[in-house]
C-alpha cells in the first residue's frame, strides 16, 4: 500500500502508474467502491456521483500519455484520510492518503519568552509522524504530532520550513513567526553624580498600530522595597504619560521607541528597572531590565572618597589615581577612600578588564575645598 | 493640496468666551494628530494645544489648562478649540496644525486673530 | 517643561552666505526636534523634522543635524527668500516648547 501524506486545505496527488507508459483504461474508487473518476477508453475523464459531490476530485490528463493516471485531491479535508484504489489492467492498486491539520496555539504572533505548540491532528490512526521545522538561520526544532517551542526569542521570527515524514513519505509546510519583544533583554547604564540619564526601549518589530499599556518598576540599592517610576498608554504608536512619581521626575517621550529621561543620576537611585509592556490583543507582557549605576567622588575632611552604587559584576574593578602616580585599587568593588590626599587632579575609574565604563575627575585643593 | 482653513477669530472681552474653527482638506483628517499654536503679537510662537487622531487623547499647555478644550469632528473634517475666561495674555493670532505620520507640524493653516481687550 | 535655547537671537548675512543656528534643549530629547521659517505676516512653513528629515519641497540648502541636547540648523548659500525668523521647536514630550526664534537680516 502507497502512502500519500497532505495537509487539510491543500492538495495531494494520488500516484497510480501503468506498467506498459501509455494511455490505458483506468478508474479511481473509494475503498467503498464508490466510483470517483476514470477514462474508459476515449481519453475523456468521466466522474462518478454528482458534479458538487467530485468537484474536488481531478486528474492530470496531461500525463496520460506516459501511462501515469492520478489522483489529485483538492482542498483536502479531514475526512479525506482514507484508502483509495486504483483499478487499472487487471489490477488494483492501493493508496492510504493522510490528511493532517497543523494547528498554532497560541498562535504565530507572540510574544518574546512564550511558547509555540504546534499540533498535527488527523482523523487516521497513524503511527507517530515525525515533524521538524527548520529556520532560515539553521535552528532546528523536531517532534512528532506535537512540536513544542519553548521561550522564543526575538529572532526566532520570521519563515520556518517544516516537514512531516511518515513511512519515509514527506509533506512540507512553512509558518511564518512574529516574535514581539524588545532588542535588547537588558541595559545597563552608568552615569556620574549629577549627569542626566537616558532609558531607551527599543522594540525589535515594526507595526502599523501598536496599543498597549507600561509601567516602570525601579528597585533602587539602598530602598527596601520597588516602586512605580511611571505608567504609560501606547495608542497607535503615540506615548502618553498616565501617571509619573514627584521623585524622580521622569520625562517620557512621546513617540516609539520608549524612551525615559531622568533629570540626575543621583545615588538614591542607583539601582534596575523592569519596564513592562502589555500590548493589546497579547496575553502576556513584554520585559525589559534597565540596570543604573552611578558613580560619586567627594572629599569630606581630610579624605577622598570614591563611590558607586548600583549593580556593577564582581568582575569590575575600582581605582582612584592621581595624575601619573600609582592607583589606589579597592579592596571591595563598590569604594576607595584616600586619606590626605595631595593637592591635583585625581581621576576615579570604574573598569571591566580593560574597558572603563565611567570615570570622574576631582581637584584637590589645598585648603581642602574641591570641584568636580 | 492640503489645506488648514482657521476662522472663528475677533475681538472679545476679558472672561468672554471664543469658539476658533479650522476646516481641514486634502488629506484623511481622522487619520492625524491636530494643534492649535499661538502667536501674541511680535512675539515668538507658542504651542497651545494638540488632540490625537481618532483616539482623542488631549494635551494642553499650562497656560490655557482648564479654559481651553481642543476637539475634533472626523465627520466634518473639522478641529476645534473653544476658549474661555479669555485674558488679555490670550491675544494672538492663532495657527491650527496637521501632524505627520512622526507626529510633527508639518501643515500650518494660515491664522486667525483673537484680540481679547475691554 | 522642556527649555530650548536658540542662538544667536538674530543676525546679519549676505545672499552666498553660510548660515548656522543652533538651539539647546534643557534635557535630552533624542531627535525629536523640528525648524520651521516664518516670514513676516505669514503663517510658518515646516522646514525640517527628527532633526535632519527635510520636509517635501523644502530646497537642498537647508539641512539639519544633532541629537540629544544640541540641534543645528545651517543654510549653505543664503537666498534673498531665506530672510526670516527661524524656530526650533522639541517633539519629545508635551508640552511642546519652541525656541525663541533667530531672526535672520540682511547685511
Known amino acids: 500500500k502507497t502512502l500519500v501524506l497532505g495537509k487539510e486545505g491543500e492538495s495531494a496527488e494520488l500516484p497510480c502508474e501503468s506498467s506498459q507508459k501509455k494511455i490505458t483504461v483506468f478508474t479511481w474508487k473509494f475503498s467503498d467502491q464508490r466510483k470517483i473518476l476514470g477514462q474508459h477508453g476515449k481519453g475523456v475523464l468521466i466522474r462518478g456521483g454528482s458534479p458538487s459531490q467530485f468537484d474536488r476530485f481531478d486528474s492530470k490528463k496531461g500525463a496520460w500519455e506516459k501511462g501515469s493516471f492520478p489522483l489529485i485531491i483538492n482542498k483536502l479535508k479531514m475526512e479525506d484520510s482514507q484508502t483509495y484504489i486504483c483499478e487499472l489492467e487487471n489490477r488494483k492498486e492501493e493508496v492510504e492518503l493522510w490528511v493532517f491539520k497543523v494547528t498554532f496555539s497560541p498562535g504565530t504572533s507572540l510574544l518574546q519568552g512564550q511558547s509555540l505548540t504546534l499540533t498535527l491532528d488527523s482523523n487516521s490512526k497513524v503511527s507517530n509522524p515525525l515533524t521538524e521545522c527548520k529556520h532560515k538561520k539553521g535552528k532546528v526544532v523536531s517532534g512528532s504530532k506535537v512540536l513544542s517551542m519553548s521561550n522564543l526569542r526575538v529572532q526566532d521570527s520570521d519563515f520556518w520550513n517544516c516537514t512531516v515524514t511518515l513511512d519515509q513519505k514527506k509533506n512540507w509546510f512553512g509558518m511564518t513567526l512574529s516574535v514581539l519583544g524588545f532588542q535588547k533583554a537588558s541595559s545597563i547604564v552608568y552615569k556620574k553624580e549629577g549627569e542626566q540619564v537616558e532609558f531607551s526601549f527599543p522594540l525589535a518589530f515594526t507595526v502599523e498600530k501598536l496599543t498597549g499599556s507600561g509601567e516602570l518598576w525601579w528597585q533602587a540599592e539602598r530602598a527596601s522595597s520597588s516602586k512605580s517610576w511611571i505608567t504609560f498608554d501606547l495608542k497607535n504608536k503615540e506615548v502618553s504619560v498616565k501617571r509619573v512619581t514627584q521623585d524622580p521626575k521622569l520625562q517620557m517621550g512621546k513617540k516609539l521607541p520608549l524612551h525615559l529621561t531622568l533629570p540626575q543620576a543621583l545615588p538614591q537611585y542607583a539601582g534596575s528597572g523592569n519596564l513592562t509592556l502589555a500590548l493589546e490583543a497579547k496575553t502576556g507582557k513584554l520585559h525589559q531590565e534597565v540596570n543604573l549605576v552611578v558613580m560619586k567622588v567627594a572629599q569630606l575632611n581630610n579624605t577622598l572618597t570614591c563611590e558607586v552604587m548600583g549593580p556593577t559584576s564582581p568582575k569590575m574593578r575600582l581605582t582612584l589615581k592621581q595624575e601619573n602616580q600609582e592607583a589606589r585599587v579597592s579592596e571591595e568593588q563598590k569604594v576607595v577612600q584616600v586619606v590626605a590626599p595631595e593637592t591635583g587632579l585625581w581621576q576615579c575609574l570604574l573598569s571591566e578588564g580593560d574597558k572603563v565604563k565611567m570615570d570622574s575627575r576631582i581637584q584637590v585643593l589645598s585648603r581642602g575645598v574641591n570641584q568636580t | 493640496e492640503v489645506q488648514l482653513l482657521e476662522s472663528g477669530g475677533g475681538l472679545v472681552q476679558p472672561g468672554g468666551s471664543l469658539r476658533l474653527s479650522c476646516a481641514a482638506s486634502g488629506f484623511t483628517f481622522s487619520t492625524y494628530a491636530m494643534s492649535w499654536v499661538r502667536q501674541a503679537p511680535g512675539k515668538g510662537l507658542e504651542w497651545v494645544s494638540t488632540i490625537s487622531d481618532n483616539i482623542g487623547n488631549t494635551y494642553y499647555a499650562d497656560s490655557v489648562k482648564g479654559r481651553f478644550t481642543i476637539s475634533r469632528d472626523n465627520s466634518k473634517n473639522t478641529l476645534y478649540l473653544q476658549m474661555n475666561s479669555l485674558r488679555a495674555e490670550d491675544t494672538a493670532v492663532y495657527y491650527c496644525?496637521?501632524?505627520?505620520?512622526?507626529?510633527?507640524?508639518?501643515?500650518w493653516g494660515k491664522g486667525t486673530t483673537v484680540t481679547v481687550s475691554s | 517643561a522642556i527649555q530650548m535655547t536658540q542662538s544667536p537671537s538674530s543676525l546679519s548675512a549676505s545672499v552666498g552666505d553660510r548660515v548656522t543656528i543652533t538651539c539647546r534643549a534643557s534635557?535630552?530629547?533624542?531627535?525629536?526636534l523640528g525648524w520651521c521659517q516664518q516670514k513676516p505676516g505669514k503663517a510658518p512653513k515646516f522646514l525640517i523634522y527628527a532633526a535632519s528629515t527635510l520636509q517635501s519641497g523644502v530646497p537642498s540648502r537647508f539641512s539639519g543635524s544633532g541629537y540629544g541636547t544640541d540641534f543645528t540648523l545651517t543654510i549653505s548659500s543664503l537666498q534673498p527668500e531665506d530672510f526670516a525668523t527661524y524656530y526650533c521647536l522639541q517633539d519629545y514630550n508635551y508640552p511642546r516648547t519652541f525656541g525663541q526664534g533667530t531672526k535672520v537680516e540682511i547685511k
Open positions: 534635557q535630552g530629547i533624542r531627535n525629536d
Open positions: 496644525t496637521k501632524d505627520n505620520e512622526d507626529y510633527y507640524m508639518d501643515v
